[in-house]
């Protein structure tokens, strides 16, 4: 069976300040078991934007119902975008582990740019 792929179809998205940004991500498989996380940036300093497993992310909503059986859509929407939100966002699949989940595969990233709010 083919190994899971993380698909971020848009290389870039441009949003006006104050609006919401939709960042799309899809998986090609339900296996392996483990959560999805979204990060801004990569490397040691990457910023956690959304964790399917736990946490409070008031500006983030999921586009589809993640708990729905056989769901493969892990797109998110971030509200009230500001220039500080600009950057490259990665959708990352983790494999369930003990004691910690392990990064399994990442999408190629979607660069979010922020336009000035229309006057």
């Amino acid at each position: 069976e083919d190994e899971l792929q993380v698909i971020q179809p848009e290389k870039s998205v441009s949003v006006a300040a104050g609006e919401s940004a939709t960042l799309r991500c899809a998986m090609t498989s339900l296996i392996p078991v483990g959560p999805i996380m979204w990060f801004r940036g990569a490397g040691a300093g990457r910023e956690l934007i959304y964790n399917q497993k736990e946490g409070h992310f008031p500006r983030v909503t999921t586009v589809s119902e993640l708990t729905k059986r056989n769901n493969l859509d892990f797109s998110i929407s971030i509200s009230n975008i500001t220039p500080a939100d600009a950057g490259t966002y990665y959708c990352v699949k983790f494999r369930k582990g003990s004691p910690d989940d392990v990064e399994f595969k990442s999408g190629a990233g979607t660069e979010l740019s922020v336009r000035a709010k229309p006057s």
């Epitope: 990060f39 801004r40 940036g41 990569a42 490397g43 040691a44 300093g45 990457r46 910023e47 956690l48 500001t82 220039p83 500080a84 939100d85 600009a86 950057g87 490259t88 990665y90 990442s106 999408g107 190629a108 990233g109």
Partner: antibody, heavy 118, light 113 residues
Framework: QVQLQESGPGLVKPSETLSLTCTVS????????WSWIRQPPGKGLEWIGY???????NYNPSLKSRVTISVDTSKNQFSLKLSSVTAADTAVYYC????????????WGRGTLVTVSS | DIVMTQSPDSLAVSLGERATINCKSS????????????LAWYQQKPGQPPKLLIY???TRESGVPDRFSGSGSGTDFTLTISSLQAEDVAVYYC?????????FGGGTKVEIK
């Protein structure tokens, strides 16, 4: 341009808590991560931890039990507390800015020497 | 933790000559999703904070002279000063920011021969 300035006592007694503040001037604290790094006299660099303006933190496991980093976005400041200090914590302490979009710590404060001694 | 090993500990180079510093990481710092190596190089002069020279292993920071260049991928990296100037006398550090904890090499002291 953006500048970082560390402040705090230069002398701390053993077993007490070291407290330093880094003030970010000329720019916003948003969008970057803000690190503390230390350098014992004549030695190399050791990363202590970082914080985002959201308050999310990441600490060096070797110091995690003694370290707290906090942020005050209204004052454009972030702070370091290191508890139960010993002479081994004597070092120049630097604050620095990191960019998760590129990598590397691209802006550093001048550093402040903290001596642990009774 | 990722261990960063620099060599040599020190080197003396004549003015105008090439200086080469090596850095080896105990595991790869290449992120396959964006094909970037999370490896940076810093210059530190006495009494001053470190200054970022290179990030992503080979991208020069703004304002850094082009005699400084970085190369390598995965676990093996090199900082080259193509023509050493008197103001380049300093200690140079490599650093990985691929995984936390962020870690630095032990430093290489560059002097004039």
């Amino acid at each position: 341009q953006v500048q970082l300035q560390e402040s705090g006592p230069g002398l701390v007694k053993p077993s007490e808590t070291l407290s330093l503040t880094c003030t970010v001037s000329g720019g916003s604290i948003s969008s970057y991560y803000w690190s503390w790094i230390r350098q014992p006299p004549g030695k190399g660099l050791e990363w202590i931890g970082y914080i985002y303006s959201s308050g999310s933190t990441n600490y060096n496991p070797s110091l995690k039990s003694r370290v707290t980093i906090s942020v005050d976005t209204s004052k454009n400041q972030f702070s370091l507390k290191l508890s139960s200090v010993t002479a081994a914590d004597t070092a120049v302490y630097y604050c620095a800015r990191g960019d998760s979009s590129s990598g590397g710590l691209d802006l550093w404060g001048r550093g402040t020497l903290v001596t642990v001694s009774s | 933790d990722i261990v960063m090993t620099q060599s040599p500990d020190s080197l003396a180079v004549s003015l105008g000559e090439r200086a080469t510093i090596n850095c080896k990481s105990s595991q790869s710092v290449l992120y396959s999703s964006n094909n970037k190596n999370y490896l940076a190089w810093y210059q530190q002069k006495p009494g001053q904070p470190p200054k970022l020279l290179i990030y992503w292993a080979s991208t020069r920071e703004s304002g850094v002279p082009d005699r400084f260049s970085g190369s390598g991928s995965g676990t093996d990296f090199t900082l080259t000063i193509s023509s050493l100037q008197a103001e380049d006398v300093a200690v140079y550090y490599c650093q990985q920011d691929f995984l936390t904890p962020i870690t630095f090499g032990g430093g290489t002291k560059v002097e004039i021969k």
